[in-house]
């Protein structure tokens, strides 16, 4: 199922390529990317009915059309649902060695510059996404992936960290950004909202959509992750949207079936082995980069984020599944755990195809705002 | 690679005890969830103990009541403090360090018998 546009019908690229349609330029955000009303509980804010989407924001509803089986960027979804009337006692905070450096949480104290100062640095992620200043960049590939299809042994460790969920990955998935640009996956987790409210961390043109999950990645340059911290391109991020569709991901069902077992904080359990690419779009060409940040304490830059164009699709129920299981710090439901976007400060957002491009009849002349900086690469 | 280096085991009467510690040599290490597993001869490592970032502890039903898991950020160091110990406590026991990457110690060795 793929969603049209949030302007009005326009025909797929040409052949059978299934190329898809850029987004729109109307109802862009401000420039500097400033905290929107979808904005998070992040460091600086708790959760509260202001954190909803005003009505003007929200999206006309379109009538779905037959495609492959995940959104796209370009096509934003419908509308958000109303917030949950009852707010979240997100991660509230147990202090059970006093304020120590480590403990930080979603909403509240401390703020996060004072766990970690990298917190406070200009470019830091999540940020919002807006296809028509994103510079297209011919020089980016479709992304590599090499051993992500993984035997049912050995198991693999799933644990509720009290910020998310978290699988451990074994050696050997091998990731590929480029020629010379080689990582290897660590981890993957996710980010998700709560009732009726979503949880990504990235958001486009201001929209949030349900759920978002990162594939965390060291540089084959470093041989351990302290030495990557910080460090240009030493940490990669895989990022997708998660949406809802009308049927149940197998893929993600592998996962969300055995959240229960791990509903408690600082709880894990073993699963099998499986297919890690099953769980993000399939295709591996059209993306967002930029270079950001880790979105939680410490927030050490460098990171390379590839944010998929193309959307993840979960049934309603596997979304529900996801912000209603899990258990955080203080007795309290883990929802909410996504950070506020941040200012880019002059960064630009390349994109592999272009998106800036707008190929409805009411564009006489594509627009693309910024040009590539990677031409060279 | 993130060194853990794990000591205190050895042999031990049943019903006695013994403390295990790790040093990490990460900078990271307040952020990382720590974390005792244990494999015996045979069988698959499981887990033993852990206490996440922000020192929450969640135990194997096995050794509840019995052990108990602490940190110490500023030595950069995990603890398990195993009291009423009985035979088939017998294994090597692994120090874990898991945030963004995973990382193992060598193992020490923990012997019950008489």
């Known amino acids: 199922q793929r969603l049209p546009r949030m302007q009005e019908d326009s025909p797929l690229g040409g052949g059978s390529s299934g190329e898809d349609d850029p987004l729109g330029e109307e109802d862009l955000p401000s420039e500097e990317d400033s905290p929107r009303e979808e904005d998070p509980p992040g460091e600086e804010d708790l959760p509260g009915e202001e954190d909803l989407p005003g009505e003007e924001d929200l999206p006309e509803v379109k009538p779905k059309s037959e495609e492959e089986g995940s959104l796209k960027l370009e096509d934003l979804p419908t509308v958000e649902a109303p917030g949950d009337p009852q707010e979240p006692q997100n991660n509230a905070h147990r202090d059970k060695e006093g304020d120590d450096q480590s403990h930080w949480r979603y909403g509240g104290d401390p703020p996060w510059p004072r766990v970690s100062p990298a917190c406070a640095g200009r470019f830091q992620s999540p940020v919002d996404i807006r296809p028509q200043l994103a510079a297209f960049c011919p020089a980016l590939r479709p992304l590599e992936l090499l051993g992500f299809q993984l035997p049912p042994l050995p198991e693999l460790r799933l644990r509720n960290n009290g910020h998310s969920v978290q699988l451990t990955l074994p050696p050997g998935l091998e990731m590929a950004l480029g020629p010379g640009r080689e990582y290897r996956a660590l981890q993957l987790h996710l980010h998700w909202g709560a009732a009726g409210r979503p949880g990504s961390e990235h958001t486009v043109e201001g929209h949030r959509f349900p759920a978002e999950i990162h594939v965390v990645h060291l540089s084959t340059a470093f041989a351990r992750v302290d030495e990557a911290l910080g460090r240009p391109g030493g940490l990669a991020v895989l990022a997708a949207f998660l949406e809802e569709g009308p049927e149940e991901n197998s893929a993600y069902e592998q996962l969300l079936s055995r959240l229960e077992e791990i509903a408690e904080e600082g709880s894990e359990t073993q699963v099998p082995g499986l297919d890690i690419s099953a769980l993000l779009p399939s295709d591996f060409s059209r993306y967002f980069q930029y270079e950001g940040s880790l979105t939680t304490p410490p927030c050490a830059q460098g990171v390379i984020w590839t944010v998929f164009n193309q959307t993840v699709m979960l049934s309603a129920k596997q979304l529900h599944t996801l912000s209603d299981t899990l258990w955080g710090p203080g007795d309290s439901r883990l929802q909410l755990n996504f950070r506020a976007t941040q200012p880019l400060n002059g960064r630009v957002i390349e994109a592999s195809f272009p998106a800036g491009v707008d190929s409805s009849p009411r564009a006489a002349e594509p627009v693309q705002l910024n040009s590539c900086l990677a031409a060279g690469d | 690679q993130v060194q853990l280096q794990e000591s205190g085991g050895g042999l031990v009467q049943p019903g006695g005890s013994l403390r295990l510690s790790c040093t990490a040599s990460?900078?990271?290490?307040?952020?990382?969830?720590l974390g005792w597993y244990r494999q015996a001869p045979g069988n698959q490592r499981e887990l033993v103990a852990t206490i996440t970032s922000r020192a929450i502890t969640n135990y194997a039903d096995s050794v509840k009541g019995r052990f108990t898991i602490s940190r110490d950020n500023a030595a950069k160091t995990v603890s398990l403090q195993m009291n009423s110990l009985k035979p088939e406590d017998t294994a090597v026991y692994y120090c874990?360090?898991?945030?963004?990457?995973?990382?193992w110690g060598q193992g020490t060795q923990v012997t019950v018998s008489s």
């Open positions: 874990n360090a898991a945030w963004i990457g995973d990382y």
């Open positions: 990460t900078s990271s290490f307040n952020f990382q969830t």
